[in-house]
Amino acid sequence: FSPLRRISIKILVHSLFSMLIMCTILTNCIFMTMNNPPDWTKNVEYTFTGIYTFESLVKILARGFCVGEFTFLRDPWNWLDFVVIVFAYLTEFVNLGNVSALRTFRVLRALKTISVIPGLKTIVGALIQSVKKLSDVMILTVFCLSVFALIGLQLFMGNLKHKCFRNSLENNETLESIMNTLESEEDFRKYFYYLEGSKDALLCGFSTDSGQCPEGYTCVKIGRNPDYGYTSFDTFSWAFLALFRLMTQDYWENLYQQTLRAAGKTYMIFFVVVIFLGSFYLINLILAVVAMAYEEQNQ
């Protein structure tokens, strides 16, 4: 080993070197949180870049750059360091049009903390391992969601467009003439029944066990879907999103109430099955895989 390499190895394995890098990263993070940084922080920025460059040079001199098994670029954690430095010099010395977009990559410096703190390294390692192991569970989840989305599509397509429509019109008005002129929120509130405080017209259905309209209103299928058109089973993609909502239990009771009001109470069976399979079983299966991966990483 050349003297330069020996010195590099000594620096690299020294605990003070790790401490210096950790303190630099944390200080850098503090500086990044500043709203309107003063001019002198520019020099501090250069110092940080210098320290990161020094760290990488030490690692490259001690381990080699890329030829050989344990060299600098063979460790994925060093890829992050390399990217941080490359972007630091790019934003500083190369005149690129939209620099603010590149400055976003400064945030990657905070991720350097992971490679320095051993505990964090383990957790992130477990996370990456779990993602690899999750592929099978993800395939199963997507498959199950797709099957239920297709069932939802067949059962509830267009149902969430059912609304309670006013039973009194002008002489020249018909359902179709109104459908063609409905645009503003004001128009909707003129012709449809709204519960107090509700942003969507009252849903209804045509089956005996679905929601009925109050006196003076009739159920029709007109206009857009609830929640600005985002809640529906009208296409496979919207149905898939609705099923994902059920699986993650993201305000799912609202979707459940809307659908049951428009389609009928019988369809609660569909929701029971989806919640049990999707929300209770699949979510816990995902958690189990993550837990197993973390356990393996710890061992």
Epitope: L169, L175, S177, F206
Partner: nanobody, 124 residues
């Protein structure tokens, strides 16, 4: 395609009466907002004569008030227009309009569904 069956048209003398029927008896007709009678005289635009909402409330054109009566038989899914004291200016093709929701088998569809029309001629 959904079809409304209209009947009762014909030739009648001024001052006479006619009863028009409009049957939406097909299972495809689910629920109407209203079912109405419209007429179109030669060279004129189609205009409302009378309509009846599903709850029974009615609307009449000024020319039909006091002479015409619209009624419905929900069991038979039929709407009737009783026309009394007919005048020559009542001569027109009378159309039935189901404004509401139909079932296509796969989904529900709301809109206007017109009949073929029945001709009413008032002349001496």
């Amino acid at each position: 395609e959904v079809q409304l069956v209209e009947s009762g048209g014909g030739v009648v003398q001024p001052g006479g009466s006619l009863r028009l029927s409009c049957a939406a008896s097909s299972r495809q007709f689910i629920r109407d907002v209203f079912t109405g009678w419209y007429r179109q005289a030669p060279g004129k635009q189609r205009e409302l004569v009378a309509r009846i909402y599903n709850e029974g409330n009615t609307n009449y054109a000024d020319s039909a008030k006091g002479r015409f009566t619209i009624s419905r038989d929900n069991a038979k899914k039929t709407v009737y227009l009783q026309m009394n004291s007919l005048r020559p200016e009542d001569t027109a093709l009378y159309y039935c309009l189901f404004s509401g929701t139909i079932s296509t088998g796969r989904e529900y569809r709301s809109g206007d569904y017109w009949g073929q029309g029945t001709l009413v001629t008032v002349s001496s």
